[in-house]
């Protein structure tokens, strides 16, 4: 789910189980041999699998947790072949005779096996035959295998948690992208769809779950009645990456929807007993109904299980009919969870349930089109969640959460287009690189733009047609454009300037986005590829010369204007954008277009004037847009930085969340660049002045912080008020944090701090405090029952101002008994976000890179987030040299999924150095003048 889907599958140490036959010599592999190529040949297609798995949840004599498996795959031969190539990773087969048995189905004659081998580099099991398999014939290949049930969060893996003082062990799966092959031999590509009959053999006191319901009840294993056999119904035709099976002692809360679909939320027995699954249960039914309606297709399976796992690397995973989640993405405790925890639960559920149709029923043929799968779900998650929580205005949150967040990356010269040619995506590492913010958030942004200019009704019509046409099949993004085009062609009210494909090609095949510049004196409008660093060199060519076909909406003096299309030309003119001297015009209403806007200086001044006199005339999203765009434009030298800062002056009269959030996230860059310099004092003073009215507003509204505002956006605004007031030294706020935390320390059983305010109060109290406060919070983390509470404490512990405490804390991240592997990156990043912790975290990452890479390489460590996190403040020549040295020093180890992030960090550091040189003086003077 979203940027948290860190599914990196490369660089996993070989499991220490019995040796297998492998071919190594990666460099000299003969590419003409199909087993040395990463893509499967299409000579054989899987029809069905029968897979039996038996996980052992106690260690064997060697201290290893293992699983044993048996698979029978039925193959249809398409072309004559004397070799069977099937994925297999870290699985051990018998060393006696051949690794597999081959049989003909019906009258198919089967050639003898010559030899079998494992090719480690391409992750294949290869069966060489003495004769050829024949087209049109079916064959069955049987294999038995053994693998390690490791705690590596990939394939069939082990998760551990404590119940009281008892360690509990469960077995679960994470197949996406390329780890189904780590659980059983399979044709592990998304277009190789087949049906699956899964059987789990498990201890009889545990529950077995899979994609489908069980066939009847579990039966005792004849040879050992302490074990049960659970056989599941046959799945529909599906991709391997969506398989899931889990053996645990989890419990569930259930309901049956009107359409007969069984909905269950599974979690640790304690969590279920305390009602932490109820919110998820309450929203799942409505969200499933919403999507069935949105897609005009009923839910394709008989049941919908969702399970919260203690060790889980992604945010969540959309396995068909058995969705897996991090605990904090599914469980909600009204007593200790904040409104943002609740928002996360409903949006992540909506994201994963959106995939049950888009992605699961209809699947992209190859990982190069991942952006459509994830971008689509990242857009419609807001629609599904909005249906479940209609009073929250959730749809607005895509603007800060996805649109502007990804624009910061997409405005770099090192960005890349949404669409990558299939032939450039082959290895597990290359597939892993597809899971980035461009795929998720830019994907979401351009699909939202498309839905907006088509209108939602027309979009839904084309979408339903696409889903009906390709159910149980595979597609490319062009298939969706084609079905949307059919919907456009069948009506007359929506007129497009070109085909859906032609318009969308501009947004998917070239990186970046345009800045639209308006001259309101003449009505001239122009477009240009927007780069945060105006001098950076774009080496990637574009077939469209970095011009887009841009849908433009606008408001003039508060009145909505006609829709306008800027064709893929650099300049045009229209009177829609021409104003009289006292008027103003504002483009990109509600930021439905994926672009930024610049105006002539007079129009900027008129907008500022409007905001300072009567801000309600401008829609709330556009009040945020004015701030976001102007700060970005200032970074790119397209407007003076003082103009952007002037656009924050109206905030002392602003109560809404989004404009404040825009300012805080824009100014967070200023903090990163200046919180080690003399600019920071006047900057804090200015922010104190601006936030004080907001702080006082909420102090009154909440009766001195004893109640909460009613709606979500106001609750978020209250959190911002306290967070900004405290971090900028407003004395009333610092006293509030200290008082509340002291109160809690004196009575640990009764936490007086409302869940919404905990993150910010904890952080500020720990920052003001010393070892006592830190150790108290660490103690609370150790006994935290709910992961949401643990997350808040873990993050707050990084707020300390004591170097030795922060260094000790960094050490804890390498001990999985103290900090779970899944939380290690975010903990190091939290420490790095603290100005005092930043150099410590950077030193730590440099010193421990090899260890981090080797111990955490199997998908449990988001290296791109880590590199980004520890280098965010870099803005000096010395830091640039350090970064270049770090790159040199670790070329042998590599950077895995962080390879691209390292290049971006180098580029960003150079840009930061330049920006500080240019802006320090003028920013210092502006803050002095306005504070």
């Amino acid at each position: 789910y979203a940027q948290e889907k860190n599914k990196n599958a490369e660089h996993v140490p070989q499991a220490p189980t019995s040796p297998t036959i492998t071919t190594t010599a990666a460099i000299t592999l003969d590419q003409s041999k199909p087993w040395n190529r990463y893509r499967l040949p299409t000579t054989l297609l899987p029809d069905s699998y029968n897979v039996t798995l038996r996980p052992y949840l106690t260690p064997n004599a060697d201290g290893l947790y293992i699983f044993k498996g048996k698979s029978i795959v039925r193959l249809l031969c398409q072309e004559p072949t004397d070799v069977i190539i099937i994925h297999s990773k870290k699985l051990n087969y018998t060393t006696q005779g051949h690794m597999v048995v081959l049989r003909g189905v019906g009258d198919s004659q089967v050639p003898e096996i010559d030899r079998t081998e494992l090719v480690e580099l391409t992750e294949y099991l290869v069966v060489h035959l003495k004769g050829s398999l024949q087209p049109g014939h079916m064959y069955e290949m049987e294999s038995e295998f053994q693998g390690e049930l490791a705690d590596d969060l990939a394939g069939f893996y082990r998760s551990e948690y404590m119940e009281g003082n008892v360690k509990k062990v469960l077995a679960t799966t994470q197949m996406q992208s390329t780890d189904a092959r780590k659980s059983f031999p399979c044709f592990d590509e998304p277009a190789m769809k087949a049906t699956f009959n899964i059987t789990l053999i498990h201890p009889n006191n545990l529950t077995a779950l899979s994609n489908m319901p069980p066939k009847g009840s579990s039966t005792p294993l004849a040879e050992d009645p302490n074990w049960s056999v659970t056989e599941f119904e046959t799945t529909p035709v599906m991709s391997t990456y969506l398989l899931a099976y889990i053996v645990s002692e989890f419990q569930s809360v259930n309901e049956t929807a009107q359409n007969g679909v069984l909905i269950r939320i599974w979690a640790r027995p304690n969590a279920i007993a305390e009602g932490h699954g109820m919110y998820a249960l309450n929203v799942t039914g409505p969200i499933l109904n919403f999507f069935a309606n949105h897609y005009n297709t009923s839910y394709p399976l008989p049941k919908s299980d969702q399970i919260a796992l203690p060790d889980f690397n992604a945010g969540a995973m959309e396995n068909w009919g058995l969705v897996t989640y991090r605990e904090n993405a599914l469980l909600f405790d009204p007593q200790s969870s904040s409104i943002s925890n609740k928002e996360r639960v409903v949006t992540v559920i909506a994201h994963e349930l959106a995939h049950q149709w888009f992605g699961n029923l209809v699947t992209l043929a190859w990982w190069n089109d991942l952006w459509l799968n994830e971008g689509f779900a990242s857009y419609v998650e807001y629609l599904g969640a909005d249906h479940a929580e209609p009073t929250w205005n959730l749809k607005d949150l895509i603007v800060p959460g996805d649109v502007y967040r990804v624009m910061a990356v997409d405005a770099l010269a090192s960005s890349h287009p949404l669409t990558t040619p299939a032939e450039e995506v082959n290895t597990p590492a290359q597939i892993s690189e597809m899971f980035d913010s461009i795929s998720y958030s830019k994907g979401a942004s351009v699909i939202r733009m498309l839905s907006n200019f088509l209108t939602e009704d027309l979009f839904k019509e084309g979408l339903a047609s696409y889903l009906h046409a390709f159910a149980y099949q595979n597609t490319t993004y062009l298939d969706l454009w084609e079905h949307l085009q059919k919907a456009v062609d069948a009506q007359t009210s929506i007129r497009l300037p070109d085909t859906v494909r032609a318009i969308m090609d501009r947004w998917t095949l070239q990186m970046g986005f345009p800045v639209i510049t308006v001259d309101t004196k003449t009505g001239n409008i122009s477009q240009k590829h927007f780069l945060l660093d105006s001098e950076s060199n774009v080496t990637r060519s574009s077939a469209f010369d970095y011009l887009w076909i841009v849908p433009i909406s606008s408001i003039k003096n508060g009145v909505m204007q006609d829709h306008y299309w800027l064709r893929d030309v650099s300049q045009a003119q229209n009177d829609l954008f021409k104003t009289a001297s006292d008027d103003w015009v504002l483009l990109n209403v509600n930021v439905t277009g994926y672009f930024q806007v610049n105006y002539d200086e007079d129009n900027w001044r008129m907008i500022q004037h409007q905001l300072q006199t009567n801000l309600s005339v401008i829609p709330v999203i556009n009040r945020a847009q004015v701030i976001y765009d102007s700060f970005n434009l200032a970074t790119a030298h397209m407007v003076p930085v003082t103009l952007a800062l002037d656009n924050t002056l109206f905030l002392n009269g602003e109560k809404e969340y989004m404009p404040w959030q825009a300012a805080l996230s824009s100014l967070s860059y200023f903090s990163l660049m200046f919180d080690r310099s003399e600019v920071y004092g006047p900057m804090k003073k200015y922010l104190r002045k601006q936030v004080e009215p907001l702080f006082q507003h909420f102090e009154t509204l909440t009766k001195n912080w004893t109640e909460r505002p009613e709606n979500l956006m106001d609750q978020y605004s209250e959190i911002n008020a306290i967070s900004t007031a405290c971090s900028n030294g407003l004395p009333q706020c610092e006293n509030l944090a200290k008082t509340l935390f002291d109160q809690w320390m004196s009575d640990p059983e009764n936490n007086p701090i409302h869940p919404n305010l905990r993150s910010t109060i904890y952080c500020n109290a720990i920052a003001q405090g010393g070892q006592d406060q830190w150790d108290f919070a660490w103690g609370q983390l150790q006994q935290a029952q709910l992961v949401n509470e643990a997350d808040k404490l873990r993050s707050a512990l990084a707020c300390s101002n004591e170097v030795w405490l922060l260094n000790r804390y960094l050490g804890y991240t390498l001990n999985p008994d103290l900090i779970r592997k899944q939380d290690a990156t975010s903990t190091i990043n939290s420490i790095a976000s603290n100005v005092i912790g930043q150099p410590l975290a950077w030193d730590f990452v440099q010193s421990n890179w090899k260890k981090l890479f080797q111990d955490y390489g199997g998908g449990s460590f988001s290296f791109s987030n880590l590199i980004q996190g520890v280098t965010r403040r870099f803005s000096s020549e010395f830091e640039l040299q350090q970064l270049e040295q770090f790159k040199k020093n670790n070329m042998d180890v590599g950077f895995g999924s962080g390879t691209r992030a390292l290049e971006q960090a180098l580029e960003k550091t150079k840009a930061n150095i330049k920006w500080v040189k240019e802006n320090k003086e003028v920013v210092l003077n502006w803050f002095i003048e306005h504070s």
Partner: nanobody
């Protein structure tokens, strides 16, 4: 080279139970499919039960299905045959065998390593 040694045979009354063990030595049997065969006086050696190298596949002769259960313990390098509801016609010398493959077979010729056998007599 794998050496196999059966034990656990003996005299038992009809309806009784016995558990035969087959201990491997010389080399681990963990990668081999293992089988039990029997030979009554004057008859050919016949298949009784087999188990694959992982233990996930078991095969039984129709005459013993539901009464006999084969299992393996790779840590102990041992294969077992639990025999319940024994009948006089189960009387025979029982042989343990290892296959040079991980996959089960019912055919005597597919097994390359054999034990010496253990006598099972079912009589009142």
């Amino acid at each position: 080279q794998v050496q196999l040694q059966e034990s656990g045979g003996g005299l038992v009354q009809p309806g009784g139970s016995l558990r035969l063990s087959c201990a491997g030595s010389g080399r681990t049997i963990s990668n081999h499919a293992m089988g039990w065969f029997r030979q009554a006086p004057g008859k050919e050696r016949e298949f009784v039960a087999a188990i694959s190298w992982t233990g996930l596949t078991t095969n039984y002769a129709d005459s013993v299905k539901g009464r006999f259960f084969i299992s393996r313990d790779d840590a102990e390098n041992t294969v077992y045959l639990q025999m319940n509801s024994l009948k006089p016609e189960d009387t025979a010398v029982y042989y343990c065998a290892a296959r040079q493959s991980g996959y089960v077979s019912k055919f005597v010729d597919d097994y390359g390593y054999w034990g010496q056998g253990t006598q099972v007599t079912v009589s009142s």
